[in-house]
């Protein structure tokens, strides 16, 4: 176990021409915050894919108001580090996404508005316990300068945080074959408890006799690289030569969860859901009371005053599990109505609404027909958050306020001349044609292709189209 730490040094315009406009203004003050998402391995996954190694959100930075006419300076940053705790081994290779978000503080409907200013991503190799690594990334005209490191949480040490340290049993030296734990010289490496032969680089253990593999390695001793060549079956170690994955024991086989815990497979390992009164990676810790602080993520512990009585964790919104250890994937509930796009910022849920919809969850269908009349006898037709006017004859435009030119579409056939009329249009037909749109030829003998023209109307006379 350990913590990935990210320190943002600056965020501002990059070098070169085309400096970006300040994201804040006197009319619309704003402040920045950052989100980091970590994924194991050198994956090139979509930004929306899960942050399997973890994610963190910074505090909000100071409120910033642009000075009129001044170019965008480096913007004021939030205090402190972004910390992403990891429970298992540090994978050594990882992908990151760092997002810079703007929170607008103007008094707009819907509360503070968040918008993504910049997103940078990269793939890096990093050993835990090493020094801070410095980086500069550019996103469009913006430049982000930052440092990062991974450090192990005691008692773990090593480049993957898989070796354990224990206080010295003797004041002067460590036991046979055991080295001091740098930088904790007063502690010694714990005796090796992994399965004999387990790769020190690619394997680790949390229980005596086991050998669990880091991503990209397989085999009973984690010495076989996983092949990317096609395999017939999806899981488990195969021959030690190819490293191809074929069916084998899954991480939940034999149920590693003690005390009635239920096991579920995760992309990299397994996870135990423990019954009340037990916790730990394998539900192995028991006799827990509220005094032990078993509720994570700000959960409220109730009951459990002594080890024999169960405690109950009342989880804060966004967390679940008997110890509030699991984050609820709020976007999986598809909370954004009417085709809105969901974004879980950690501290809040945001929906990006399709045109025609508004509200925190895109629940507000912008019904433009309400209180909006179509002029000149037109009727309003709603649909999908938009509206249109179906105009009466002779009128057009968005609100039927414009007089339509009925002749614009050249409605008179066979060279007939069109005349606009208050009730529509009139066609004056060329010789040899008749009908409201001059659509019927007049036969040489004077008969038409239709029944005779109405009394009093000679072929060639203008016909009014009503």
């Amino acid at each position: 176990a350990g913590v990935f730490e990210l320190q943002i040094h600056s965020f501002g315009p990059g070098p070169g021409p085309g400096a970006p406009r300040s994201p804040c203004s006197a009319r619309l003050p704003c402040r920045l915050f950052f989100r980091v998402c970590l994924k194991p391995g050198l994956s090139e996954e979509a930004a929306e894919s899960p942050c399997a190694l973890g994610a963190a959100l910074s505090a909000r930075g100071p409120v910033y108001t642009e000075q009129p006419g001044a170019p965008a300076p480096d913007l004021p940053l939030p205090d402190g580090l972004l910390q992403v705790p990891f429970r298992d081994a540090w994978p050594g290779t990882f992908s990151f996404i760092i997002e810079t978000w703007r929170e607008e503080l103007g008094d707009q409907i819907g509360g503070p508005a968040w918008s993504l200013l910049a997103r940078v991503a990269g793939r890096r190799r990093l050993a835990a316990g090493g020094p801070w690594a410095r980086d500069i990334q550019r996103a469009g005209a913006w430049e982000l300068r930052f440092s990062y490191r991974a450090r192990c949480e005691p008692p773990a040490v090593g480049t993957a945080c898989t070796r354990l340290c224990r206080p010295r049993s003797a004041p002067s030296r460590c036991g046979p074959g055991l080295r001091p734990c740098a930088p904790l010289e007063d502690e010694c490496e714990a005796p090796l408890v992994c399965r004999a032969g387990c790769s020190p680089e690619h394997g680790f253990c949390e229980q005596p006799g086991e050998c669990r593999c880091l991503e990209g390695w397989t085999g009973p001793l984690c010495t076989v690289p996983v092949s990317t060549s096609s395999c017939l079956s999806p899981r488990g170690p195969s021959s030690a030569t190819t490293g191809c994955l074929v069916p084998g024991p899954g991480p939940c086989d034999g149920n590693p969860c003690a005390n009635g815990g239920s096991c579920s497979e995760t992309p990299r390992s397994f996870e135990c859901t423990c019954p009340r009164g037990f916790y730990g990676l394998r539900c192995e810790v028991s006799g827990v009371t509220c005094a032990d602080g078993p509720c994570f993520n700000g959960g409220l512990c109730v009951g459990g005053a002594d080890p024999d009585s169960a405690y109950i964790c009342h989880c804060p919104p966004g967390f679940q599990g008997s110890n509030c250890e699991k984050r609820v994937d709020r976007c999986s509930l598809q909370p954004c109505r009417n085709g809105g796009l969901c974004l879980d910022l950690g501290h809040a849920l945001r929906c990006r609404c399709r045109a025609g919809f508004a509200g925190p969850r895109c629940e507000h269908d912008l019904d433009d027909c309400a209180g909006r009349a179509c002029a000149n006898g037109g009727t309003c037709v709603e649909g999908g958050g938009a509206h249109r006017c179906s105009c009466a004859l002779g009128f057009g435009g968005r609100d039927c306020r414009e007089r339509a030119d009925p002749c614009a579409a050249r409605p008179c056939a066979h060279g007939g001349r069109c005349y606009a009329h208050f009730s529509g249009l009139v066609c004056a037909c060329a010789p040899g044609y008749m009908g409201a749109r001059c659509e019927f030829p007049v036969h040489p003998d004077g008969a038409s292709a239709l029944p005779a023209a109405p009394p009093g109307l000679r072929p060639g006379d203008p016909q009014r189209y009503l």
Partner: antibody
Framework: EVQLVESGGGLVKPGGSLKLSCAAS????????IHWVRQAPEKGLEWVAY????????YYADTVKGRFTISRDNAKNTLFLQMTSLRSEDTAMYYC??????????????WGQGTSVTVSS | DIQMTQTTSSLSASLGDRVTISCRAS??????LNWYQQKPDGTVKLLIY???RLHSGVPSRFSGSGSGTDYSLTISNLDQEDIATYFC?????????FGGGTKLDIK
Amino acid sequence: EVQLVESGGGLVKPGGSLKLSCAASGFTFSDYGIHWVRQAPEKGLEWVAYISSGGYTIYYADTVKGRFTISRDNAKNTLFLQMTSLRSEDTAMYYCARGDYDDIFYTMDYWGQGTSVTVSS
Amino acid sequence: DIQMTQTTSSLSASLGDRVTISCRASRDITKFLNWYQQKPDGTVKLLIYYTSRLHSGVPSRFSGSGSGTDYSLTISNLDQEDIATYFCQQGNTLPWTFGGGTKLDIK
């Protein structure tokens, strides 16, 4: 325990005004949106108005738009409904109800016991 | 506005019966459907949200199902304390609308 207690109801003449209050306890008031819902005698439930946790988002039913104003005081854990230009059809039991956290479902998960409003000359 | 229709306005059943109350929306509400119970004294409680999720403290004999425009509330083993009026409510699009209610009593 989540508790919502409405007050301020009573008898008022048509065209008159009334201000309802809803006192909240047992939860972090400023984390939740709150609704007003009413029920006319022998009728069903009718949603009236909603205000988001920070007071930024406010919605009204068309039947009360322009006459009713919803507001909240997070420091005092209190919700208000200012009703003006009252009509006989506004006669109902008025309930305040807590919205769900994050407004994912737009549920009303806890309700008060209601306060009665009668509009009559 | 989305209209919510509860076709059965009243229903009589015996203790221990399985009772189903239906609710229809005038258009797809994408499972944002909640059920409430109103006791004769006026007390209102949320039973089920998002079509099928049981609100905390609600007995497991209550269940919900449905999708699109058609939804139902089922009480699997009718108890005396279930005598009440049941309302559905859509939380998909403003304004939030309720069904007319189904009054349940004991035969």
